[in-house]
Amino acid sequence: VNAIPDQCSPLPCNEDGYMSCKDGKASFTCTCKPGWQGEKCEFDINECKDPSNINGGCSQICDNTPGSYHCSCKSGFVMLSNKKDCKDVDECSLKPNMCGTAVCKNIPGDFECECPEGYRYNLKSKSCEDVDECSENMCAQLCVNYPGGYTCYCDGKKGFKLAQDQKSCEAVSVCLPLNLDTKYELLYLAEQFAGVVLYLKFRLPEISRFSAEFDFRTYDSQGVILYAESIDHSAWLLIALRGGKIEVQLKNEHTSKITTGGDIINNGLWNMVSVEELEHSISIKIAKEAVMDINKPGPLFKPENGLLETKVYFAGFPRKVESELIKPINPRLDGCIRSWNLMKQGASGIKEIIQEKQNKHCLVTVEKGSYYPGSGIAEFHIDYNNGSNAEGWHINVTLNIRPSMGTGVMLALVSSNNTVPFAVSLVDSTSEKSQDIVISVENTVIYRIQALSLCSNQRSHLEFRVNRNNLELLTPLKIETISQEELQTQLAILDKAMKGKVATYLGGLPDVPFSATPVNAFYNGCMEVNINGVELDLDEAISKHNDIRAHSCPSVWKKTKNSEDQVDPRLIDGK
């Protein structure tokens, strides 16, 4: 009988996977190393796919190898000593200056260098750098970048305001339409803040005498209606208004006289006025009733070469005349004349001149008050320092307003360095058809009076007092204010400005940067201002935009019967 050869020789088992080979009767048994399986230990066990030990017990990556396996970690993780678990590497703790001046934030497997909003991390400099949002065209009109942010502005002077998205601009809309109808037959006397509205020259036969007839309407109490003089300036006649009454000043080779008389006619009604040179006197009539008779020894204007040459100026006089007046007068007069007849020549020629020039036309209907059309400002120089007051400077303001647009600067103090240490403005409220009143120091809103129905037929009354320690609102309104601590900081800024030179502006702002104030639009509407007990007369302003009407306010377009005409009862002027 032949002996059965050793079945383990030659080796039938997989050399890499077997541990031992056992010879049997015509058979063999391979005993496998851990990690191997199969009759000849030829198959690697994939421990990573073992359902009884998910992922080989590895917390992240399981790498199968012939006869074995090992765990590994993703980038940014480190293996724990049990060779199974991966722990996040806290790079921020590992290298504390990893982000330089930025804040290091650890995230699983990585880290981030965090910067405050409005800043971007610069890898090179390891620092947070301001994002220039303005270079990214974030704003529709003007953009001002500052460290950590930006602010959009709109050109209020062109009638725009910032939309609710704080980026785009929208037109400041009319909230109370006004009757701005004019008639060329009505000559507006306040077309120029400084200067004559109309200048006429008459060459008439020597038998002619001076005469002027016209209808006159005003709420203004003082100003020049007309001034007439001889060609050589040797004789002159001034017809003016003072204290609401007609005043006549005259001077020639024979006499020099001033007379005031008659009833007060600055009542907003049309009054018929006539001034006629008679043989021995000058007769002044109102509504055809004589109110003054001024004696004169000879003719008012001396004829020369058989001709009476006279120059007539409406609403003003030549500059050199100012020093010659018997009694000085502020010539500015906000009023209208119609149906004029000068030197008995009728209105011929004049109407044609006026017809062409829209700004010489007067409003058909007006009310008492001052009108800001949203195109300019008036400047005053007011001394706010009160020697008797221990607080130093103080500002007591009363505003009577009837806005026709819901956004605009009503009152502002401007420093010589072009900052706006104090402003009172109107802004359209977020709630529909109402307005907020904002009081600001530079570009910080310190008070906000919210959601008032100001665009109404009735005037609204607002009163407040400011000194270096406090801002007090005397009108009983719900206000939203900054913290007391922040208010004191802002009042300190105002105090510093008040110790220097400040100019007072009504109706808007001069040329200051857009970013100087929260609001930069011109105010549009009617407004009377009283500062420290003095009613401001726009005729007394240092300068005033020609379109601002000092003593006349357009009427509301049409009286509606809906609730929009209701004004907050707390704001109604009780005067």
Epitope: S81, K87, D88, D90, C92, S93, P96
Partner: antibody, heavy 119, light 106 residues
């Protein structure tokens, strides 16, 4: 398998000195950060000192309570970490553990050696 | 130095009962680690990076939290879970531990 074995504990008088040793095996010692943590009934677990790897310039850090008195050191060739303790105080009494530290946690702890500071 | 306050200091739970212990931090930290220590033994890393269980730790354990408030929860208490649990954080070159919560079985 990771092994950490502390030695050198015992009784010492206040003001005295003592050196603790920790023998490590089962991991690449030269790449490891090693720390000493102590435990006492009064203070609970309290971190004492850390020595980082050669890659981190063997930087050392100490708890405020031991700064200037204790010194941590290592010998990568012997896979050993040491804690030299001087000016010992009674409040230094406790079990001192040698730990293998991975990414700011105490991954593996030795069995500890007890130090008693008493007169 | 950041202080860790564990509460409660001692608590007991019946088998099967849910257990929650907290670790309050004096100022915000990114991660919290937890250790288990049984009498006569060294502490053992139990939960790392706030919520990751170390291999071999039963799934009934979980960790959560962020900022200044962290917790370790045991969904169903078992006798082998009786031990003292410590929280630990690292910040500004300093390691700090909580005072521990001793969990006993009723």
């Amino acid at each position: 398998e990771v092994k950490l074995e502390e030695s050198g504990g015992g009784l010492v008088q206040p003001g005295g000195s003592m050196k603790l040793s920790c023998a490590a095996s089962g991991f690449t010692f030269s790449d490891a950060w090693m720390d000493w943590v102590r435990q006492s009934p009064e203070k609970g677990l309290e971190w004492v000192a850390e020595i980082r790897s050669k890659a981190n310039n063997h930087a050392t850090y100490y708890a405020e309570s031991v700064k200037g008195r204790f010194t941590i050191s290592r010998d990568d060739s012997k896979s050993g970490v040491y804690l030299q303790m001087n000016s010992l105080r009674p409040e230094d009494t406790g079990i001192y553990y040698c730990t293998l530290t991975t990414a700011f946690l105490f991954d593996y702890w030795g069995q500890g050696t007890t130090l008693t500071v008493s007169s | 130095q950041i202080a860790l306050t564990q509460s409660p200091a001692i608590m007991s739970a019946s088998p099967g009962e849910k257990v929650t212990m907290t670790c309050s931090v004096s100022s915000s930290v990114s991660y919290m680690h937890w250790y288990q220590q049984k009498p006569g033994s060294s502490p053992r890393l139990w939960i790392y990076d706030t919520s990751n269980l170390v291999s071999g730790v039963p799934g009934r354990f979980s960790g959560s939290g962020s900022g200044t408030s962290y917790s370790l929860t045991l969904s169903s208490m078992e006798a082998e879970d009786a031990a003292t649990y410590y929280c630990q954080q690292y910040s500004g070159y300093l390691y700090t531990f909580g005072g521990g919560t001793k969990l006993e079985i009723k």
